[in-house]
């Protein structure tokens, strides 16, 4: 059964990736017009389920082509702190919360996503878990 | 390797429906999009407009806006070009092309081998 | 639309020699506050499908030969070949991408003297 410190340290790490997350997406936003319409044709696999840390594996599998996009988007407009940075602090914030024991085939849904509903999508998940442990 | 496969020359007369085919072979189909150019007898290329196979998402030029319509079956990893009346103008080579992730931040780097499409009566 | 102009219409080259095809387009191609030029070259070998050789003004597609080289600036690019083989020959297409719908120049037709 998971402890007390331990359930602390998995909504701190929640807390730390919902924040990353939201920081991207807040840039994105706040981005002017020409190139939000820009990024938006750059698609993303959204899962099929995500109720679960280990459907973290699903967002591991797309955090290449998010440093991608936001590497090519980036601009005077639209500056994120170092982007390799950045995704490599989510990964491995999503190695620690999914585990390493399970090796899960992430299942996809139907369509494709663009980068604002994909990121909406694992903010709202983060939120969901964070809400179960308090 | 990854291709694009076209679908046969045509022969078509005026007013005739006709739907050509692009086959992706090698890559992920559902994460590039693809696009279609036309090339009119001894002609430039033109740019006709564009699907991602992952969510349907079309782009048409307006030059070609209600001309011909584009999509795409996923589950065959195919996109097709459309004509429900063909027009003798319409005689062409149709080449199909990927076009990364996204269209406005890559070129297109694999190109189909070309559909040629006659259209007389 | 952005138009795109390219010159010379033909362009007859001397093998091992230096060659230059001239792109113009209607309105700047440079995102300044990216600092990308959404300018593409491509070439379309007699009888055969175009292939891209130059994207985002001056990077070499996979497989291309370095004696291709895009250079410019705003509305002004060039494709440079520095010493051409007989395997260049054929049409070469600037086309933009900074703003839909994508367009392509008319073409310059490269042929051997």
């Known amino acids: 059964a998971p402890t007390s410190s331990s359930t602390k340290k998995t909504q701190l790490q929640l807390e730390h990736l919902l924040l990353d997350l939201q920081m991207i997406l807040n840039g994105i936003n706040n981005y002017k017009n020409p190139k939000l319409t820009r990024m938006l044709t750059f698609k993303f696999y959204m899962p099929k389920k995500a109720t679960e840390l280990r459907h973290l594996q699903c967002l591991e599998e797309e955090l290449k082509p998010l440093e991608e996009v936001l590497n090519l988007a980036q601009s005077k407009s639209f500056h994120l702190r170092d982007t390799k940075d950045l995704i490599s602090n989510i990964n491995v914030i999503v190695l620690e919360l999914k585990g390493s024991e399970t090796t899960l085939m992430c299942e996809y849904a139907d369509e494709t996503a663009t980068i604002v509903e994909f990121l909406n999508r694992w903010i709202t998940f983060c939120q969901s878990i964070i809400s179960t442990l308090t | 390797e990854v291709q694009l496969v076209q679908s046969g020359a045509e022969v078509k007369k005026p007013g005739e429906s006709l739907k050509i085919s692009c086959k992706g072979s090698?890559?992920?189909?559902?994460?590039?999009?693809i696009g279609w150019v036309r090339q009119m007898p001894g002609k430039g290329l033109e740019w006709m407009g564009i699907i991602h196979p992952g969510d349907s998402d079309t782009r048409y030029s307006p030059s070609f806006q209600g001309q011909v319509t584009i999509s795409a079956d996923k589950s065959i990893s195919t996109a097709y070009l459309q004509w429900s009346s063909l027009k003798a103008s319409d005689t062409a080579i149709y080449y199909c092309t990927r076009q990364g992730r996204s269209f406005y931040y890559y070129g297109m780097d694999v190109w189909g081998q070309g559909t040629t499409v006659t259209v007389s009566s | 639309d952005i138009v795109m102009t390219q010159t010379p219409l033909s362009l007859p080259v001397t093998p091992g020699e230096p060659a230059s095809i001239s792109c113009r387009s209607s309105?700047?191609?440079?995102?300044?506050?990216?600092?990308?030029?959404?300018l593409d070259w491509y070439l379309q070998k007699p009888g055969q499908s175009p292939q891209l050789l130059i994207y985002t003004l001056s990077y070499r597609a996979s497989g291309v030969p370095d004696r291709f080289s895009g250079t410019g600036s705003d509305t002004d690019f060039t494709l440079k070949i520095s010493r051409v083989e007989a395997e260049d020959v054929g049409v070469y297409y600037c086309?933009?991408?900074?703003?839909?719908?994508?367009?392509f120049g008319g073409g310059t037709k490269v042929e051997i003297k």
């Open positions: 086309m933009q991408r900074i703003e839909f719908p994508l367009t």
């Open positions: 090698g890559y992920r189909f559902t994460s590039y999009w």
């Open positions: 309105q700047s191609l440079l995102d300044s506050d990216e600092g990308n030029t959404y």
